[in-house]
Interface confidence: low
């Protein structure tokens, strides 16, 4: 899916508003710098590819995000201000349903919400896409985003 | 205990518009998206649009789009569904519903209970 | 956009039989909701993503079905199930089915 036509103001708001802070609730009890940012993003739309995959792809390790309340609220969002993503999603949800069949916290899902969390920051602090670029504008960036 | 009520009956005039309201209580209203959805007499539902109360972030069904309006007051935890250019056709009970995100699909899981709306001349 | 078919358009039954009801989508979609409706009053929601009961609905109602064919099943009619029965899909905005009506035989 390419999130470049993206309501990216709304999905922002729908972040600061209650995905952040459900993030952080699944996150409680493990200090801020228990994990290293290996995961990072250019701009908008990339940050939104990053942040689908990490969320709803099941990985070894951790196959039960996409049942988490950050998740589902992250899933809304994109439904609702992404054109046409609910329909890219079919299959991946049919396949995330086979995968969940328990809500494990296993510390492998502790490093990825991590990871997210700083997807997150970045989408909603997009400056520098690379060096010597100048600060980040939405117009701008419909030319640098990545297809995946 | 999750309530949606609306508003009264409305008897409109063609070209005229309408204002339902639906006041939400027992959750924090801008926390949960809110559908509005028609049925018109003997019809099936009819999904018109969806609200993100926290923002104002809207969707709309195409066929509705342009003159249906969806707003909300947060500090009243009310959504409103505007309806202009009203016809025969427009005669319809309207329901709120609100989204929750429990269940995969975000199902409507509160509705209110609904406000019927006659447009005749 | 998504066109659900129910079928049958009616059905006609008598207490403590078993109703089968079709939700037919014109294309794929991930899950299904059901609702019931009786007159006057608003839709209530029965299954959640095809095959969750609702909170307070009986275990004589299930769902099942995937890609474009999904099924509600009441295993013993009682007379307070008599009524309009709607799908609705999610996948693509929100679209729901013409109803199906079980009445009394």
């Known amino acids: 899916y390419d999130f470049t036509n993206c309501d990216f103001e709304k999905i922002k708001a729908a972040y600061l508003s209650t995905i952040s802070k459900d993030l952080i609730t699944y996150m409680s009890g493990t200090k801020s710098t228990e994990f290293n940012n290996t995961v990072s993003c250019s701009n908008r739309p990339h940050c939104l590819t990053e942040i689908q995959s990490l969320t709803f792809n099941p990985t070894a390790g951790c196959a039960s995000l996409a049942k988490e309340m950050f998740a589902m609220k992250t899933k809304a969002a994109l439904a609702i201000w992404c054109p046409g993503y609910s329909e890219t999603q079919i299959n991946a949800t049919q396949a995330m349903k086979k995968a969940r069949k328990s809500k494990v916290t296993t510390n492998k899902c502790l490093e990825q919400v991590s990871q997210l969390q700083g997807l997150w920051r970045r989408f909603n602090r997009p400056l520098l896409k690379q060096q010597g670029s100048s600060d980040y504008k939405d117009d701008d960036d419909k030319h640098h985003h990545h297809h995946h | 205990e999750v309530q949606l009520v609306q508003s009264g009956a409305e008897v409109k005039k063609p070209g005229a518009s309408v204002k339902v309201s639906c006041k939400a209580s027992g959750y924090t209203f801008t926390d949960d998206y809110m559908n509005w959805v028609k049925q018109a007499p003997g019809q099936r539902l009819e999904w018109i649009g969806i609200i993100s109360p926290y923002n104002g972030g809207t969707s709309y069904n195409q066929k509705f789009k342009g003159r249906a309006t969806l707003t909300v007051d947060k500090s009243a935890s009310t959504a409103y569904m505007e309806l202009s250019s009203l016809r025969s056709e427009d005669t319809a009970v309207y329901y709120c519903?609100?989204?929750?995100?429990?269940?995969?699909?975000?199902?409507?899981?509160?509705w209110g209970q609904g406000t019927t709306v006659t447009v005749s001349s | 956009e998504i066109v659900l078919t129910q079928s049958p358009a009616t059905l006609s039954l008598s207490p403590g039989e078993r109703a089968t009801l079709s939700c037919r989508a014109s294309s794929s979609v991930s899950y299904m909701h059901w609702y019931q409706q009786k007159p006057g009053q608003a839709p209530r929601p029965l299954i959640y993503a095809t095959s969750n009961l609702a909170s307070g609905i009986p275990a004589r109602f299930s769902g099942s079905g995937s890609g474009t064919d999904y099924t509600l099943t009441i295993s013993r009619l009682e007379p307070e199930d008599f009524a309009v029965y709607y799908c609705q899909q999610w996948s693509s905005n929100r679209t729901f089915g013409g109803g199906t009506k079980v009445e009394i035989k």
């Open positions: 519903a609100r989204e929750d995100y429990d269940y995969d699909g975000y199902a409507m899981d509160h």
